[in-house]
Interface confidence: low
């Protein structure tokens, strides 16, 4: 039928930067490129029905269903979802095509279903059908990788029992400390499950799939390095595999390595050794201690000894359940307006935590850094000197932890005033909390020095949203001050601010701000 309009249906996926929920025809988000949904004429249907390709959406994702109509003249439209009519506002693009949009913010089960769009143009009426479903991610998991010895080979296999099957990669680094950060040129990545080169300084295995990325580091004792001041500690849960690597370099091959658990040699089948020549014809030996599935009695001090190096130990602790150890008492800080300051939380946790910093309902990324003493630390410096409540939240598979911080910024008060027929009120948010004075300006006191003490009510500091403190003072109007100018002043150790109010009979009240340092 040549009267039929040319219809294009597209799906726009949005990168969410909005926490609101609802349906709208505006564009509140950053968009990715549109995906064509086809929109084919549905055969054997009464009337003209176009059907878009099925749309699968992740939970909480935001999308726009959009129809572009290449038809002459004006169009009117109506969306119907679950028997409810929804507002529809067509507009025209630069090519003069009619554009109709349905924005779904933060996809939930209740928003899944059939969306019908009825369009009426000057030539004809037609219906467009969209089917929106939530992507089935119930099967998805991402588990931290673990190591196994490859059968009959001196090699490690990295396994992550995740769904969808993850891409596994080894992350290798041969220098130390900061230079082994993920994007450093010293870091080499190998996208394979089996690793034969086991002599590197730092060896990690990472698994990634649609859910993200998880990594496990091969725990290593290096006999050529000065031992840490505190004994290194390794936590594992019952049933997990234990892998410790002992590494030593010597001028020749005339040395050997052994593992002991609580002064008893490890049994055959729980260790294997490898050796290779390093630079300057020195010899590297590595000795792995491993237990395929740990039990409580595998807890203890594992000591690696060498005939040519001082011994070093690690404490292996087997736990039934994961944990997060940190002090959860809330902490209050007061700082100057330009003072450099970071919140910090020191914790010990197993398995590794996922964490966020939150302020004013906004979440910020959380970085954690391992310390030499087995503790980790997370710092947050991006507070931009905004006073209020900051929340650190951490969780792993077995435990949750929350810690509250209050940040107060020392600053001179700033006064806001409002008045009604019966009273005048002043508000201030300076810190430390200000004290108040009220003064009357009259012929006798042109400089407003006559203090008012009666009818003044100082309200106890009132916490604003997200922890910012506000103090207020109210003056009840009396005949003695009606028609006069009065001045309210807030003062603290950093200065004073005042505002002058004309106490008229009811009507608009002019305010004169008056800052005194």
């Amino acid at each position: 039928n040549q009267d039929l309009p040319v219809i294009k249906c597209v799906l726009i996926n949005h990168k969410n930067n909005d926490s609101s929920v609802g349906k709208s025809s505006s564009y509140p988000m950053v968009s990715e490129s549109p995906e064509d949904l086809g929109c084919a004429l549905r055969p054997q249907s009464s009337g003209t029905v176009y059907e878009a390709a099925a749309v699968e959406v992740d939970v909480s994702a935001s999308i726009t269903l959009q129809v572009l109509v290449d038809a002459p003249g004006n169009i009117s439209c109506l969306w119907v979802f679950k028997h409810s009519s929804l507002n529809c506002q067509p507009h025209f693009d630069l090519q003069n095509r009619g554009v109709v949009s349905m924005v779904i913010l933060k996809m939930t089960e209740t928003q899944a279903g059939e969306y019908l769009l009825f369009i009426q143009s000057e030539a004809t009426n037609y219906t467009i059908l969209f089917t929106v479903s939530i992507r089935n991610t119930l099967l998805y998991t991402l588990r931290r990788p673990y190591f196994r010895k490859m059968e009959n080979q001196d090699a490690l296999v990295c396994i992550s029992e995740s769904v969808p099957e993850p891409i596994v990669e080894w992350v290798l680094c041969d220098s130390q400390g900061e230079s082994c950060k993920e994007e450093s040129p010293a870091v080499v990545k190998k996208e394979e499950k089996v690793l034969h080169e086991l002599f590197g300084m730092d060896i990690r295995c990472c698994a990634r799939n649609e859910l993200g990325r998880e990594c496990t580091r091969l725990f290593t004792i290096d006999l050529n390095q000065t031992p840490q001041t505190t004994l290194p500690q390794l936590f594992l849960k019952v049933g997990e595999p234990l892998w410790i690597r002992c590494k030593a370099v010597h001028v020749n091959h005339g040395f050997g390595l052994t593992w002991e658990l609580e002064n008893k040699a490890l049994e055959e089948g729980n260790y294997f050794e490898m050796s290779t020549y390093s630079t300057n014809r020195t010899m590297i030996r590595i000795l792995f201690a491993f237990v395929s599935s740990v039990a409580r009695n595998d807890t203890g001090y594992y000591t690696c000894s060498s005939s040519k190096h001082p011994s070093q130990s690690a404490l292996v602790t087997i736990v039934e359940k994961g944990f997060i150890n940190a002090t959860n008492s809330s902490e209050d800080y007061e700082i100057d307006q330009y003072e450099e300051f970071c919140f910090s939380v020191r914790f010990k946790a197993y398995p590794q935590i996922r964490c966020t910093w939150t302020f004013s309902r906004k979440s910020f990324p959380c970085e954690q850094k391992g310390l030499d003493n087995g503790y980790s630390i997370s710092k947050f410096c991006n507070h931009k000197h905004q006073p209020g409540e900051y929340i650190f939240h951490a969780e792993n598979d077995d435990a949750q932890f929350t810690k509250m911080f209050t940040l107060n910024i020392r600053r001179k008060p700033q006064v806001l005033a409002e008045a009604s027929a019966s009273q005048a009120s002043c508000f201030s948010d300076g810190y430390p909390l200000p004290s108040w004075t009220w003064k009357k300006c009259s012929d006798k006191s042109p400089n407003c020095t006559e203090e008012i003490t009666e009818g003044v009510w100082n309200r106890k500091a009132n916490r604003k949203v997200f922890g910012q403190w506000v103090s207020s003072s109210t003056l009840n109007m009396s005949e003695a001050i009606k028609g006069f100018l009065v001045k309210c002043c807030a003062y603290n150790s950093l200065g004073t601010s005042c505002e002058t109010i004309l106490l008229n009979s009811p009507g608009p009240f002019p305010f004169i701000q008056d800052n005194i340092s």
Epitope: G38, E56, I159, P164
Partner: antibody
Amino acid sequence: QVQLVQSGAEVKKPGASVKVSCKASGYTFTSYYMHWVRQAPGQGLEWMGIINPSGGSTVYAQTFQGRVTMTRDTSTSTVYMELSSLRSEDTAVYYCARGIGSKGAFDIWGQGTMVTVSS
Amino acid sequence: DIVMTQSPLSLPVTPGEPASISCRSSQSLLHSNGYNYLDWYLQKPGQSPQLLIYLGSNRASGVPDRFSGSGSGTDFTLKISRVEAEDVGVYYCMQGLQTPYTFGQGTRLEIK
């Protein structure tokens, strides 16, 4: 070596149920999805559903929803597919296939189980 | 559901000659992770299907290098550089982007 061994051929009456088994060996059973695919005589391949042996979650094709049940027994590394309310058009060879990931890539297939539905 | 369309449905080839099979999907099979979720399978007479190519262009282990897969989005091709007698059977493409996973109708390759 990695293999999937299925149960033998079945002849069923319309309205009855059939349960086909698929025993996995040579790999970690819980690390891979298992899919079921059928093929009617002289026809193409039709995907029926998927089971995650780790946890037992399932997704079925709409066509079979309500009639198919996929289960697993991790102690014997076996997956089962039960199809109820059989009709003559269910006559087909039923295959189990291991998925490398969740999204297809069936790298290992069972030998197939012929199910005949006839009165 | 995503519809998969193969062509040709029958492909007579002389041994040693190249062969090419086309597969078209009703919507793009390109995932946001950069992978095209399209597989190719060969079902030899009287046998179970076997995986040839996964994720559009990756040869499965043990598959001869005369088989190659290419394409992206909605258009995909399986090429056999030199057909051998053992390559006869029905070739299927399958989309693994979204459930229900769907197969093409199949292309029967036969020796001339």
